[in-house]
């Protein structure tokens, strides 16, 4: 049969509230060198135990008996500290354990989860969480809204999760945890009611450097909207924004709109350019969430200036005209040039040159028409830009280079000669 246990004192019991400090103690009497005392909790050796061991010899000789006392300190009692505690020693080839002591937790309820501050859109459902535990169990919860209980008694209403169907004003929520030892009150959570996200953001009208947009405001509870903020950002080949990134890839253009009306004119935009826009509306409680980014595009405009450096020379019945692209913004994709020439007493001739920047004209007759002038205009899909000032045809002087160009004969059919009143750009004739 086994040798008699060396333990002469076993751990006691500790029961208390969270945070309690206590000590478990065991004592043994051994002959010869005192062993190291280990502590077990629920059968598991405590590797980082806050324990102290005191050894007192009972005689002069090392081989005499020793009293060994081991004390385990529990500094701030937690649920994880609860269980059955024993001392463990190895003596020779035998293992001895003390009788067990028990550590229990009993006190006011302890919150594992408390309601958190949050923002919600007006009239939008949400949930709040609260969780508490003993011991002692059971723990019953009572929810309060603006300090008013939401049930007749603890345990009768919602427990861990409170479903709120919607709020129209900023409110406070807390929960009370009740057990046999008393009541603990959670923190008070402030639920801030923000405006709902605006809806139906859309374009009202488009101009090359201007977009007019409108939207429908969401509900904002008892708090009127103070303003709405619109952001526009250049679309970077659709990467960031369309992939659902919450923030634009570059600094957006931001405009504020007084409300109502829920409409805004965005100016100073680039023509023929894709943008993404979004809107959020603000009350005294804060801003709504942004709408999704809406892709929009400014339309093309006409070129803002005439072609540059026009030169026109004449040699008999031929005229050579060349020019350069307008320096002013094109406001779109350049589709080509129109050229008009006219003599003093002859009708104006209008031609579409396409994208070339030079042309050789075959003039009618022997070239005796006097005071010939040429005008050039650039055009985009949106229409013609301004015409250049008329450039007189200078006589060609020997020695001047005369490049060989495709000849463009003056049309003999009147289809190419537009009536004068159509030439609203052409006021100089």
């Amino acid at each position: 049969q086994a040798e008699e246990s060396p333990f002469v004192g076993n751990p006691g019991n500790i029961t208390g509230a969270r945070g309690l400090t206590g000590t478990l103690r065991c004592q043994l009497q051994v002959q010869g060198e005192p062993p190291e005392v280990h502590w077990l909790r629920d059968g598991q050796i405590l590797e980082l135990a806050d324990s102290t061991q005191t050894q007192v010899p009972l005689g002069e000789d090392e081989q005499d008996d020793w009293i060994v006392v081991s004390q385990l300190r529990i500094t701030s009692l937690q649920l994880s500290d609860t269980g059955q505690y024993q001392c463990l020693v190895f003596l020779g080839h035998q293992t001895f354990v003390s009788q067990p002591g028990y550590v229990g937790l009993e006190g006011l309820p302890y919150f594992l989860e408390e309601p958190e501050d949050r923002t919600v859109a007006a009239n939008t459902p949400f949930n709040l969480s609260c969780q508490a535990q003993g011991p002692p169990e059971p723990v019953d919860l009572l929810w309060l809204q603006d300090a008013v209980p939401l049930a007749t008694a603890p345990g009768h209403g919602p427990q861990r999760s409170l479903h709120v169907p919607g709020l129209n004003k900023t409110s406070s929520f807390s929960c009370e945890a009740h057990n046999a030892k008393g009541v603990t009150t959670s923190r008070t959570a402030t639920i801030t009611v923000l405006p709902q996200q605006p809806r139906n953001l859309h374009l009202v009208s488009r101009q090359p450097t201007e977009l007019e947009v409108a939207w429908t405001p969401g509900l904002s509870g008892i708090y009127p909207l103070t303003h709405c903020t619109l952001q526009a950002v250049l679309s970077d080949d659709g990467m960031g924004i369309q992939a659902g990134e919450p923030d634009p890839p570059e600094e957006p253009l931001t405009s504020q709109a007084s409300v109502p009306p829920h409409q805004l004119r965005l100016g100073s935009l680039h023509p023929h350019t894709p943008y993404h826009i979004r809107v959020a509306c603000t009350s005294s409680q804060g801003p709504s969430s942004w709408t999704h980014w809406l892709p929009v595009e400014t339309p093309e405009g006409v070129p803002l200036g005439p072609p540059e450096n026009i030169s026109a020379t004449r040699n008999g019945s031929q005229a050579f005209v060349h020019w350069q692209e307008p320096r002013a913004p094109l406001q779109g994709t350049l589709l080509g040039y129109r050229l008009a020439y006219q003599g003093q007493d002859t009708p104006e001739v209008l031609m579409d040159i396409g994208l070339r920047q030079e042309v050789t004209l075959e003039l009618q007759g022997d070239g005796s028409v006097s005071n010939l002038t040429v005008c050039v205009a650039a055009y985009t899909a949106a229409g013609d830009g301004p015409w250049s000032l008329p450039v007189p045809l200078e006589a060609w002087r020997p020695g001047q280079a005369q490049p060989v160009h495709q000849l463009v004969k003056e049309p003999s059919t009147p289809a190419f000669s537009w009536p004068h009143h159509h030439h609203h750009h052409h006021h100089h004739h």
């Epitope: 049969q1 086994a2 246990s5 280990h38 077990l40 629920d42 059968g43 598991q44 050796i45 590797e47 980082l48 059955q84 024993q86 463990l88 293992t95 354990v97 009788q99 067990p100």
Partner: antibody
Framework: QVQLVQSGAEVKKPGASVKVSCKAS????????INWVRQAPGQGLEWMGW????????KYNEKFKGRVTMTRDTSISTAYMELSRLRSDDTAVYYC?????????WGQGTLVTVSS | EIVLTQSPATLSLSPGERATLSCSAS?????MYWYQQKPGQAPRLLIY???NLASGIPARFSGSGSGTDYTLTISSLEPEDFAVYYC?????????FGQGTKLEIK
């Protein structure tokens, strides 16, 4: 000397239950935890849980919760492990082992075969 | 749970040679325990509290290590040492075992 002697081999059908016993001697039975560890054929060791005979308190591995029950009879220094709703993958040798923060003494093992 | 990984899975040595078995824990632990198992037998405790020799175990067995890396050393192999060796931890629940190292005669 410390000894743990287990009951004999069992053959069970899927869905049935098995109850294995472990008789302790050579030490104060109520002072030390009795653990159950199983070993499937050609496999490693898997801890199932413990019982403290002094109080009857138990702790089970989450994997076996709901299927395993550990009990003891202090008058005959015997611990029991019952496993219910047996499946073919419960075929294993089941060991009882005394623990003092580790497993210092083991029973000889009980082979449980689950087969239809 | 803490996973223990033993290496090598198989170790082939001759009697008289030195054997070094390793056990690596997936997170830091305080103590390691080692067991020997022979075919048809229950495991037997060899080393407790990382480095203490269990009752009746020859002094050629020793254990060491800390943190996540632990070692069982057999200084000079005897024929009866060829078996499967398991490491085990109980620093956190549940207690877990390594998958074993088979020590076989070369």
């Amino acid at each position: 000397q410390v000894q743990l002697v287990q009951s004999g081999a069992e053959v069970k059908k899927p869905g049935a239950s098995v109850k294995v016993s472990c008789k302790a001697s050579g030490y104060p039975f109520t002072d030390f935890y009795i653990n159950w560890v199983r070993q499937a054929p050609g496999q490693g060791l898997e801890w199932m849980g413990w019982i403290y005979p002094g109080s009857g308190n138990t702790k089970y591995n989450e994997k076996f919760k709901g299927r395993v029950t550990m009990t003891r009879d202090t008058s005959i220094s015997t611990a029991y492990m019952e496993l219910s709703r047996l499946r073919s993958d419960d075929t294993a040798v089941y060991y009882c082992a005394r623990s003092t923060g580790f497993f210092d003494y083991w029973g000889q093992g009980t082979l449980v075969t689950v087969s239809s | 749970e803490i996973v223990l990984t033993q290496s090598p899975a198989t170790l082939s040595l001759s009697p008289g040679e030195r054997a070094t078995l390793s056990c690596s824990a997936s997170s830091s632990i305080g103590y390691m325990y080692w067991y020997q198992q022979k075919p048809g037998q229950a495991p037997r405790l060899l080393i407790y509290l990382t480095s203490n020799l269990a009752s009746g175990i020859p002094a050629r067995f020793s254990g060491s290590g800390s943190g996540t890396d632990y070692t069982l050393t057999i200084s000079s192999l005897e024929p009866e040492d060829f078996a499967v060796y398991y490491c085990q931890q109980w620093s956190s629940n549940p207690p877990t075992f390594g998958q074993g190292t088979k020590l076989e005669i070369k």
